[in-house]
């Protein structure tokens, strides 16, 4: 476990001609805030794929009003770091998206309006525990300067935050088989953390979270002895057929402790040792609130204002579990026919079909496509005895070998500006619009498209867009 930290140093006009207009005006003062989205690996994922490593939103920056006639300066920034906690190992290679958002503070009804000013993306290698890395990225006429690092949360150390360190118990040296923890020479590398409840006497692990049994012990937590004969150790009624004593059900069988609690037998019953954030006889009560950010993978937390009321995580498509921690493997149902490759994009399934097949599930057999190759993930489509390639986003031409401009189709609604970047396209919306492609007016025009208000309600006066 650890934290990715991002420090924004400046956001302002880039070098060269064509300085951008100030995003704020005397009539419409505004302030900036930033969003960072992290994904593991260097794969070119779709822009809308979940921020699997995590995401964070900055505080709002100081209110800024343009001075008439003055060039757009570096804009005032929010205080503090953007911090993205990660629960598991730091992957070492990651993709990032940093968005600069403008919040307009005019007198519009219904609160402030937001629009995306700039979006930068990149792919980097980074070892946890290293120094701050500095970066400059440009988006159109804007320039963003920032630094970032990944650091491990104690007791984790190492370039991936997978090694654990504990203070030395003896001043002179570490225990058997354990090395000093560089760079913390006064600490020792701790043994691996096995599965919760794994017997410390009879179990061990070579990977975090597993529980392997020493000879003579069995069960998921290595708590069940195996006798030297073919019988199990005595704990219950005799078996008439073998003459062995068969174990009766123990109070910890099936692990009655919920939420990762570990069970230990007591003379009369059992006792659960609960992980942080849970309590109750079976660790069934969560002490976590929405303020603790318990929903992963972009899940929305609802309820849970105080520790005694439950919270619910509403998971984005492609994730499930009480904390949105499980990725739904919808490809396990093998929905793609004719040997098609299944891609779970989170919000949707895509099938990448073999040559000669097409359709959402590769269900159409295209004889005249046999042997035809479309490059860069394109699909061959039959058409009146001929064949053509339906190209993936960002590619064009007869065989999808030419780079295409994803903005050529004018995909942003309501005058939004389109920007191409490595994972597709991004729309920077005109004031008064929002949505992935600027399709939602924040305050729709009172005229034309609106139906009459239902009886008993006076419709609002027609208003222009923000």
């Amino acid at each position: 476990a650890g934290v990715f930290e991002l420090q924004i140093h400046s956001f302002g006009p880039g070098p060269g001609p064509g300085a951008p207009r100030s995003p704020c005006s005397a009539r419409l003062p505004c302030r900036l805030f930033f969003r960072v989205c992290l994904k593991p690996g260097l794969s070119e994922e779709a822009a809308e794929s979940p921020c699997a490593l995590g995401a964070a939103l900055s505080a709002r920056g100081p209110v800024y009003t343009e001075q008439p006639g003055a060039p757009a300066p570096d804009l005032p920034l929010p205080d503090g770091l953007l911090q993205v906690p990660f629960r598991d190992a730091w992957p070492g290679t990651f993709s990032f998206i940093i968005e600069t958002w403008r919040e307009e503070l005019g007198d519009q009804i219904g609160g402030p309006a937001w629009s995306l000013l700039a979006r930068v993306a990149g792919r980097r290698r980074l070892a946890a525990g290293g120094p701050w890395a500095r970066d400059i990225q440009r988006a159109g006429a804007w320039e963003l300067r920032f630094s970032y690092r990944a650091r491990c949360e104690p007791p984790a150390v190492g370039t991936a935050c997978t090694r654990l360190c504990r203070p030395r118990s003896a001043p002179s040296r570490c225990g058997p088989g354990l090395r000093p923890c560089a760079p913390l020479e006064d600490e020792c590398e701790a043994p691996l953390v096995c599965r919760a409840g794994c017997s410390p006497e009879h179990g061990f692990c070579e990977q975090p979270g597993e529980c392997r049994c020493l000879e003579g012990w069995t069960g998921p937590l290595c708590t069940v002895p195996v006798s030297t004969s073919s019988c199990l150790s005595p704990r219950g009624p005799s078996s008439a057929t073998t003459g062995c004593l068969v174990p009766g059900p123990g109070p910890c069988d099936g692990n009655p402790c919920a939420n990762g609690g570990s069970c230990s037998e007591t003379p009369r019953s059992f006792e659960c040792t609960c992980p942080r954030g849970f309590y109750g006889l079976r660790c069934e009560v969560s002490g976590v609130t929405c303020a603790d950010g318990p929903c992963f993978n972009g899940g929305l937390c609802v309820g849970g204002a105080d520790p005694d009321s439950a919270y619910i995580c509403h998971c984005p498509p492609g994730f499930q579990g009480s904390n949105c921690e499980k990725r739904v493997d919808r490809c396990s149902l093998q929905p793609c026919r004719n040997g098609g490759l299944c891609l779970d994009l989170g919000h949707a399934l895509r099938c990448r079909c073999r040559a000669g097949f097409a359709g959402p599930r590769c269900e159409h057999d295209l004889d005249d496509c046999a042997g035809r190759a479309c490059a860069n993930g394109g699909t061959c489509v039959e058409g009146g005895g001929a064949h053509r390639c339906s190209c993936a986003l960002g590619f064009g031409g007869r065989d999808c070998r030419e780079r295409a401009d994803p903005c050529a189709a004018r995909p942003c609604a309501h005058g939004g500006r389109c920007y191409a970047h490595f994972s597709g396209l991004v729309c920077a919306c005109a004031p008064g619009y929002m949505g992935a492609r600027c399709e939602f007016p924040v305050h729709p025009d009172g005229a034309s498209a609106l139906p009459a208000a239902p009886p008993g309600l006076r419709p609002g006066d027609p208003q222009r867009y923000l």
Epitope: L300, G435, A436, F440
Partner: nanobody, 117 residues
């Protein structure tokens, strides 16, 4: 032509919950960007929450953490789950669809939500 039919409105006490439904005809909702708007008497119609055709979700500040928008492609419907309702949430709630093929907006007729004790 896309027709939108809202349902689920009604009278609810402060702190209560309601779920609004928007059923779309003609198009699959997975190919539309759909949003919920509301209009209180004498006020401008305002965006509450939207779900783009790519599945990304957008919420207005005053409802973040209380309202959740979701989509059921099989039922060709979009839902707005409203929790911890307040008196200021009283309004007519409209379903809106943006159809990319012709860059056209469609509106439902609205459903009235009244939050009052």
């Amino acid at each position: 032509e896309v027709q939108l039919v809202e349902s689920g409105g009604g009278l609810v006490q402060p702190g209560g919950s309601l779920t609004l439904s928007c059923a779309a005809s003609a198009d699959s909702v997975s190919f539309l960007s759909i949003a919920w708007y509301r209009q209180a008497p004498g006020k401008k119609r305002e965006l509450v929450a939207g779900i783009s055709d790519d599945g990304s979700k957008h919420y207005f500040d005053s409802v973040k953490g209380r309202f959740t928008i979701s989509r059921d492609n099989a039922k060709n419907s979009v839902y707005l789950q409203m929790n911890s309702l307040r008196a200021e949430d009283t309004a007519v709630y409209y379903c809106y669809a943006y159809r990319w093929e012709e860059s056209r907006q469609y509106w439902g007729q609205g459903t009235l939500v009244t939050v009052s004790s």
